[in-house]
Each structure stands twice: as structure tokens, then as C-alpha cells.
Amino acid sequence: MAPWPELGDAQPNPDKYLEGAAGQQPTAPDKSKETNKTDNTEAPVTKIELLPSYSTATLIDEPTEVDDPWNLPTLQDSGIKWSERDTKGKILCFFQGIGRLILLLGFLYFFVCSLDILSSAFQLVGGKMAGQFFSNSSIMSNPLLGLVIGVLVTVLVQSSSTSTSIVVSMVSSSLLTVRAAIPIIMGANIGTSITNTIVALMQVGDRSEFRRAFAGATVHDFFNWLSVLVLLPVEVATHYLEIITQLIVESFHFKNGEDAPDLLKVITKPFTKLIVQLDKKVISQIAMNDEKAKNKSLVKIWCKTFTNKTQINVTVPSTANCTSPSLCWTDGIQNWTMKNVTYKENIAKCQHIFVNFHLPDLAVGTILLILSLLVLCGCLIMIVKILGSVLKGQVATVIKKTINTDFPFPFAWLTGYLAILVGAGMTFIVQSSSVFTSALTPLIGIGVITIERAYPLTLGSNIGTTTTAILAALASPGNALRSSLQIALCHFFFNISGILLWYPIPFTRLPIRMAKGLGNISAKYRWFAVFYLIIFFFLIPLTVFGLSLAGWRVLVGVGVPVVFIIILVLCLRLLQSRCPRVLPKKLQNWNFLPLWMRSLKPWDAVVSKFTGCFQMRCCCCCRVCCRACCLLCDCPKCCRCSKCCEDLEEAQEGQDVPVKAPETFDNITISREAQGEVPASDSKTECTAL
């Protein structure tokens, strides 16, 4: 299959991404134009036949003029200017602004909390399995296996710090060498980028928003994958990371430091610990082949325990088994010795929802996974809505200019590096690259930050998370200090190497181009985003894991042909776009391949069949609910079903469908307001600024 089906060159030529009559959504739908329109006073639109649904959202207006889909939308202000307001209006506007700010911070807080709980949920569902991945002895000899274990474990526990800490404890207890740990760390770096990709999926409702959000999230993925693609073979061949970090660790006499400051956790922990608390040591114990840990629950039951260290007398088979000759005696029949025993006495139970349920980890994990995804989705929608209403006119202009504008010549090149520092700093503050990049995703989606600017911020985030790890390493106890510091430094230098590869020269900023390409495909075929997520974060790592277990011969036997085909396709693709004349006529395009191998159209038809069935059920349910609601409140226009349902109804009736504006998943009242069903006075209270 061609790597980017139906895409020509990487240049942003929107014509290439259009299919049928329903083309690209104008990136910046002019909201002011829509505000007071009713359904029957629609601007002229191209009447088309309803195409197979590409996702759960409807298709949108045909653009009158085709824009670059990557241009940032101009969020125009529909409200009254500040100067034109009376005192009452100004006071009202001020309090509205304060209210919005409080709401924004509130939703942001729950967004971060839901990320934390999502991580806990993943650990409950797949934590023990993740721990068992580590207990595989082949990691030592197979760097590729180490890499995929790093990816899988981090994806399963949704936390690179958890997987890294397992690696550290394994290295410090000599179960793993630093050399074997490096590929796992690289894998953990890849695995941690899944979180913001999941967050981007939440913005699937609006095509252009999703294009930007998904590309902005996957730029992180591509950076990590490409870095590994280049640096893992280099590391295997030269062991440069191991050597450099060893020199650093040996040349400094590090004293145990303080713990990395938990800044964000201080605010979120009081809430998240009321939902669930986990005993993360269990995963580490499983990784270290502790048989007892396999039966332990990850859900923490006792939060206050009293640990009493006492010496007890125990019988031993012979004096050779004594702890020391001086601590050895007999009672005349048996030999005795003194042993240090730690008694753990449970004092107080934890105060979280699941403490008294005694449910299996999988059940708790599933419940939390669903709930956290719902909260995450809800918070994200609300954040986007609030930001959308705040970032209009002057405010948007100022913010966009501040974030996306470069320094004046000749210092323009420095802007990106400053962004890297900002990303690192912000990640250090929030103590999590996942949180930072996930918070960045909706901002990219709504068009506040360009992908070009998000890229260095993301790279900085990668650095920031490693500085946190270095601080944590310096705070670790004596025996673990060296190994944890060396691993943290490996992580740091890996990311530095990646930045040197894929950032300084604009030409080498491949992740941006790849992410944009994926963004275009995913905006058109939204199911492809989920497909990408499953393939890259689960299927490929699991396949490599399975083949590695089968042995080197099998891995090479399957891997070499696959790699060869990929290289062949890439070379052919490069020649097709750069110098097609070199190639024979047949190879100048992909038409020689069957349609299913070069286009996503046939696949889309299959997916549409499945999703269409689900969509019909969903809409029927929606319609029933709406009608019940309307009957109760005795108002014919009180409730409207989602746009997709109307389209489906009309399609069933065999009518031509005028494709509407992107209000698909918006709040009912807001969508009605946009279509002029709500009195215009409602929108007059809109504030332009906080």
C-alpha cells in the first residue's frame, strides 16, 4: 500500500484532498456570517448526493474558494466593541470574562485530573501484563524487543515515568543492564506520545479542527518514531548513549538531591486520590519476577500502615544457614538464628471510591477508563468552546501573534529554540509531558498555535520530562542513584540527539510534514486516526514482540522483507514526486496497483458499512429522546437531534442534501443560535475579551 494513499506531494494542495463534490471544509468558517441565518435563507450551496459517512460527523459547506487547510482560522468577533458598551454592559462583560476564566481553569483542572485517572485506569487494566513484559529474559540480547516492550508497557500504563522507574529498579537490582535498558527507554518515549493522540481524537467533531489537532498530536509520535528509527541502530552499533552517560556519572560525585518538586500534582492529587489510589510497587515487583505480587491488587486499600522491624528467632537446618556465627545457637535439638522481620500493620483505609468494593483490577480499570475518557472528552469540548468564545478578534490576534510570530531578523532562528525551552520549562512545572502536550492539542485544533510552533514546544516537552527524571534520579537512594541517573541521562541525550536530527535544519523537520500528511488523511477518513493509533501503538509492537519471542531467525525472516518493501515503496514514491521520467511509464504512478492497495476509498466503504449501522441506532435513540423531551416541555423547537441524524433521515427519503455548516457536535443551544433559532439578543451579550 502506498504510504500516504491518494496524496501526491507533501505540498499543501487542498485539491488533492477533495473527494467527490464534498470537499475540504473552509478552515475558517466565518462564524459572523452564519449567526443570523435560518435554514431557509442558506447561501447558495452545491447540492450533492450523500456520500458514505467518513465519520460520525456530517460533511460541510463546499468552499467558494479553496484555502490552504493549514492556515489558521480567523476567529472573528461577533460581539459589541468595548467602547460601544454602557457601564452595565461593561460590568456584565467583565464578570462574564471572570466567569469564563474560572470555568476554563475548572475544566482544565478536571482535564488534567482525568488524564491522571486515565493513566491509573490503564495501569489497572494492563499494569500486571506490562510488568510481565519486563520479566522476559530476551530483553537482554534483543534491543528491538526492548524497544517494543518500552512502547507496550508505557501504552498500557499510560505513564513513561512508571515504566522508567521499573527499568531503574531492575537495573539497580542487576536484573537488567544499562545497555539493555536504553531501547526500553526509547520505547517509553514513543509510548508516552499516545496520550495526546487520544486527546486529539476527542476533537473529531470538526473536520478542520481535527486535522490540526491530530497533526499537532502526531508530530510528537513521528518525532519519537523517526528518532528511534535512526538512533536505535546507532546505539546498537556504537553504544554512544551508554558511553556518554557512563562518563558523566563517573566523573561527577553526585550527592543525593531533593525530590523533583510536584507542582501540578499538589493541586490534582487531592481530587484524584478520592477517585482511586494505586500501589504502583506491584507492577515493579511483577517485573522483578516476584510471584507473590501477581496475586496482589493494584488498588490501594490501606493508606496508613505501621511497619515494625523486629528480630525474631527462627530455626534453621544447620549452623551454615545462620545469619552469622555469633547469631547462631541451639536449643539442644534444633539450630536457631536471628532474622530481621518487618511486620506491616494496617491502621487506616484509603479514602477513595473503590476502597470497599473489592472489585477485580480489570473491573475497576474498565470503569475508570470509560469515566475518565468521558470526562476528558467533556472537558475538552468545553475548553474548546470557552477558548472559542474568548479567543475572538483582538484577543485572538494578540495571542496568535505572540505565540506564532518569530523574532526579528537575524534572530528569527532563535524563536524555535526559545519555544523548546518554554516547552521544557512548562513540562518541568506540570511534571508530565503527557499533560503538557495534551493541553497543547486543543489549542492547535482551534488554531491558536500553528503546528510549526507546536513542534518545538513538543520537543521541549520531551526534554522537560527528562530533566524531571534526572532530578528524581538525584533524589533516589544510594544504591539506585547511579543506575537511575544514568538511565535518566540516556533518556535526556536520546531526546537531545533526536532534536539535533529533526529540528535545526528546516529541511529535516520531517515530523511536521508527516504529521500534516496524516492530518489530511485523518480529516478525510476519520476512522484512519483510530486505525493509526491501533497499528502504531499496539499491532506493530505486539507483532515485533511475538516475532522476537519466536527467535532472531523468525524476526529477521519476516522483518527483512517488510523493511525491504517499505524502503522500495519510499524510494519509488520519492522518484515519482522528484523525477518521474527516470521511471518506466507504469511506475510513474500507483495505478498499476489494485485500488484497495493504493487508496483508502474501498476501505472507507467497508468502515462506513459498520459505522453506518451504529450511527442509525444512535440517531434513532437520539430522536426518541428528543421527541420525549419536546412532549414534556410542550415546545416543538426545544430540542434538536444532531445534524447527522437529519442527514440520515433525508437520505432515507431520497432527497438531495445541502451540506451544512460545522455545528455537528456543538451544544444544541449554540447550534440553534448559529442557525438563528435563538433570539439575537442572546448573542449580544458576547464579550470580546476577558
Epitope: 528467632n313 556465627p325 555469633s326 545457637w329 541451639t330 536449643d331 539442644g332 535439638i333
Partner: antibody, heavy 119, light 107 residues
Framework: QVQLVQSGAEVVKPGASVKVSCKTS????????MHWVRQAPGQGLEWIGA????????AYNQKFKGRVTLTADKSTSTAYMELSSLRSEATAVYYC????????????WGQGTLVTVSS | DIQLTQSPSFLSASVGDRVTITCKAS??????VAWYQQKPGKAPKLLIY???TRHSGVPSRFSGSGSGTEFTLTISSLQPEDFATYYC?????????FGQGTKLEIK
């Protein structure tokens, strides 16, 4: 209170056997070892062996092995020491002593049984 | 077997005197040492175990010290009832062994 009461003095001929008993009370018989110690006239103390009445496990001093058999009857909380193939140098006071749990110190002793071997 | 050597074998002292009896082991026995008091015609009586721990009912004037190979029993102020023979015993390994005894007499 803990009490260990031993059987009375015995006079035996050389080559014969003798069984000395030690009846206990005031504690759980099966939880502590029972040691046997001998003291020849005007001499020091010498450990013969010990039995754990709970399981019947025994340990002997090599010097006495084969000539001493230690047994215990849980039903009567009584420990026994049988001395066989007696010689004149076996003449001594034989003590039973309760071992402290978990180590070899002896906290309670019987009054002693004098065994005299003479023809 | 571990040999225990007590010194002195005989000791004359007066009431109120401070008396020290030593016991040397042929090898390291840790603190697995006990001290007994035996009066003529009677069974031995446990005074000290674990080299330093006084058995219940034993007067505080009796104290034990030492570890490894050298141990001492100290009577801080001799009383008339303290005149007897004193034995040390090791229970570090089988067979359990006793010292030859120290006879404490009235001066």
C-alpha cells in the same frame, strides 16, 4: 507453677538397665524441650541429650549415644530416660531440666535421681 | 565440642564483697551463654541467660556480661545465701557444654 518431679534413687548392677522418669506439671509439656544432665559425685554438670515432646525429636551427646534413650509420654506429661549397659562410672545424679523456648538455657530442674551402679 | 573454662575454680569472699567469675569459650559462642547456681545436694538454678538477661526471680545483684569468647558473672554484694558453686553453659552448638564450675566459699 512449673514443677518437675523425678523418680526415686536406683541401685543397679553393671550391664543392667534403668529407666528414670520425670513428671511435669504447671506448663504445656509439648512446647518445651526436656534436657537430661548428669553430675558424677564431686564433678561438674554434663549434658546427656534432649527430647522435644511435641514431635518426639531427640538429640544426644555423642559420648552417651547408644547407651541412652529418651522418650516422652504426652498423655501423662512425663519424660523418660533409659540407661542401658550400665558400668560403674555411670554412677551419678541424673537431672531432667526444662529447656527455655527457642534456646538451650534450662530454667526449671527436677530434684535429681541418684543412680548407683555396683555389683 | 566447645570447651568452657571457668576461673577461678575456687573463690573465697566475705559477705558484702563484689565478686567476678569469668568463663572462657574455646570458640565464638555469640551471647549463647547461661549461668547457674548450685548448692550442695540441690539441683542447679538458672541465674542468667543470653549472657546478660536475668531469669525471673533472680536478685539484681547478679549480673552477666560479655560476648564472643569471654563472659563474666558478677555478684555486686555477696549475701550469705550466695555461697555455692557457679556453672557457665554454652548453647551455641551441640553438644551443650558446661564449665567445670567455680566454688564460692566464705572467707
Amino acid at each position: 507453677q512449673v514443677q518437675l518431679v523425678q523418680s526415686g534413687a536406683e541401685v543397679v548392677k553393671p550391664g543392667a538397665s534403668v529407666k528414670v522418669s520425670c513428671k511435669t506439671s504447671g506448663y504445656t509439656f509439648t512446647t518445651n524441650n526436656m534436657h537430661w544432665v548428669r553430675q558424677a559425685p564431686g564433678q561438674g554438670l554434663e549434658w546427656i541429650g534432649a527430647i522435644y515432646p511435641g514431635s518426639g525429636a531427640t538429640a544426644y551427646n555423642q559420648k552417651f549415644k547408644g547407651r541412652v534413650t529418651l522418650t516422652a509420654d504426652k498423655s501423662t506429661s512425663t519424660a523418660y530416660m533409659e540407661l542401658s549397659s550400665l558400668r560403674s562410672e555411670a554412677t551419678a545424679v541424673y537431672y531432667c531440666a526444662r529447656g527455655m523456648y527457642g534456646h538451650g538455657a534450662m530454667d526449671y530442674w527436677g530434684q535429681g535421681t541418684l543412680v548407683t551402679v555396683s555389683s | 565440642d566447645i570447651q568452657l573454662t571457668q576461673s577461678p575454680s575456687f573463690l573465697s569472699a566475705s559477705v558484702g564483697d563484689r565478686v567476678t567469675i569469668t568463663c572462657k569459650a574455646s570458640q565464638d559462642v555469640g551471647t549463647a551463654v547461661a549461668w547457674y547456681q548450685q548448692k550442695p545436694g540441690k539441683a542447679p538454678k538458672l541465674l542468667i541467660y543470653w549472657a546478660t538477661t536475668r531469669h525471673s526471680g533472680v536478685p539484681s545483684r547478679f549480673s552477666g556480661s560479655g560476648s564472643g569468647t569471654e563472659f563474666t558473672l558478677t555478684i555486686s554484694s555477696l549475701q550469705p545465701e550466695d555461697f555455692a558453686t557457679y556453672y557457665c553453659q554454652q548453647y551455641s552448638s551441640n553438644p551443650l557444654t558446661f564449665g567445670q564450675g567455680t566454688k564460692l566459699e566464705i572467707k
